[in-house]
Amino acid sequence: RVTTNPVDLWSAPSSQARLEKEYFDQHFGPFFRTEQLIIRAPLTDKHIYQPYPSGADVPFGPPLDIQILHQVLDLQIAIENITASYDNETVTLQDICLAPLSPYNTNCTILSVLNYFQNSHSVLDHKKGDDFFVYADYHTHFLYCVRAPASLNDTSLLHDPCLGTFGGPVFPWLVLGGYDDQNYNNATALVITFPVNNYYNDTEKLQRAQAWEKEFINFVKNYKNPNLTISFTAERSIEDELNRESDSD
């Protein structure tokens, strides 16, 4: 028998770490599974935003270009719509995702900069101004939300909320990468995380989640967009890799 479960491989059954993990998982449920993307925009330049009125120019990193954000949102929505099959049943992200306010709010937790815009193309495009001049747009909203992620009103002319659709805040250090200090606008990468429910001693539910993760991996592996460089991982990825190595051995 080949052992590929990383927990079994790297911790002894009677070790203190394993005993504590067992205790935690049994009483509180195991820590959720994470499916994650790291996205860069190699062909896009950084750009300068000029706040109104007469603030200092603010540079914005390549992935924070409006067109790139729309393309990333398309990808994110496509991932949300991935379906898998397990035991002749369809499994969707909705079936397995972490929805902390369920049943009142059944939206999946998606930790993404796009959730500052409620994962909506129209909110992302929301702006105040005329043909000549934009008083407030996604730049304004972004700069506000990274400072106050739990806000229900960005206090700009937009008056848009920052809170994610799942009902919680999206902390900037979880969804952006490559920035300096707290200058999140300089980000060179976007991070999107889909937390998925994990299960203690429920093989059936676990395999449903793994079935969806398999489709997630296939989808992202084959996703083509020359403007985006996508790195990705699923909770099952380490075990998949161990399986692959075991098979080749």
């Epitope: 109104y52 007469s54 105040k128 101004g129 005329d130 043909d131 000549f132 001049f133 008083y135 002319l157």
Partner: antibody, heavy 112, light 107 residues
């Protein structure tokens, strides 16, 4: 194609009020601020104010505060300029604009 | 509020000549400046915005330049249809403000 169609010429008596309209086509007025500009005969252009049709928020030049009222009806995609307490000084051509695009103008003549 | 001062108030030129109209803002408006042409009985037509970007369909003989407080509109090789009144306008937020206009006449 973006177009701004303004209402026809008006001849009104001093002291009366008038409401000029500007109907937009080719875009949704909720997506842009709409401005009104005044031009007296043989004179230059003068900004009156603007409205954000999405929420009705307005801004006026102090000179036109109390004289002009800008409103919008997003259902008919129309913005309005109401002028009250009319005098001969209000005789002018009034234009609506969103920046790149302007209406053809409405001529208002105030005369007894 | 920002004031716009345009000069000259009028100028005469012949077809084929090059003319320059200037506009000064009372404070920094970066590059938020537009130029319009207006013919008798017509609404203003946008020529240039953001100080130097030519509006759609505007001939390349028109060019805008400047930033901050000093701006100019240059018309190369004047054509008969170029005569009329020219206005500058700042569009750095609101209120918009217009220059007094420059009347360009045929010599």
């Amino acid at each position: 194609e973006v177009q701004l169609q303004q209402s026809g010429a008006e001849l009104v008596k001093p002291g009366a009020s008038v409401k000029l309209s500007c109907t937009a086509s080719g875009f949704n007025i909720k997506d842009t601020y709409m401005h009104w500009v005044k031009q007296r005969p043989e004179e230059g252009l003068e900004w009156i104010g603007r409205i954000d049709p999405a929420d009705g928020n307005t801004e006026y030049v102090p000179k036109f505060q109390g004289k002009a009222t800008i409103t919008a009806d997003t259902f008919s995609n129309t913005v309005y300029l109401q002028l009250s307490g009319l005098t001969s000084e209000d005789t002018a051509v009034y234009y609506c604009s969103r920046g790149y695009y302007w209406g053809q103008g409405t001529t208002l003549t105030v005369s007894s | 509020d920002i004031q716009m001062t345009q000069s000259p108030a009028s100028l005469s030129a012949s077809v084929g000549e090059t003319v320059t109209i200037t506009c000064r803002a009372s404070e920094n408006i970066y590059s938020y400046l537009a130029w319009y042409q207006q013919k008798q009985g017509k609404s203003p037509q946008l020529l240039v915005y953001n100080a130097k970007t030519l509006a759609e369909g505007v001939p390349s003989r028109f060019s805008g330049s400047g930033s901050g407080t000093q701006f100019s509109l240059k018309i190369n090789s004047l054509q008969p249809e170029d005569f009329g009144i020219y206005y500058c306008q700042h569009h750095y937020g609101s209120p918009w403000a217009f220059g007094g206009g420059t009347k360009l006449e045929i010599k």
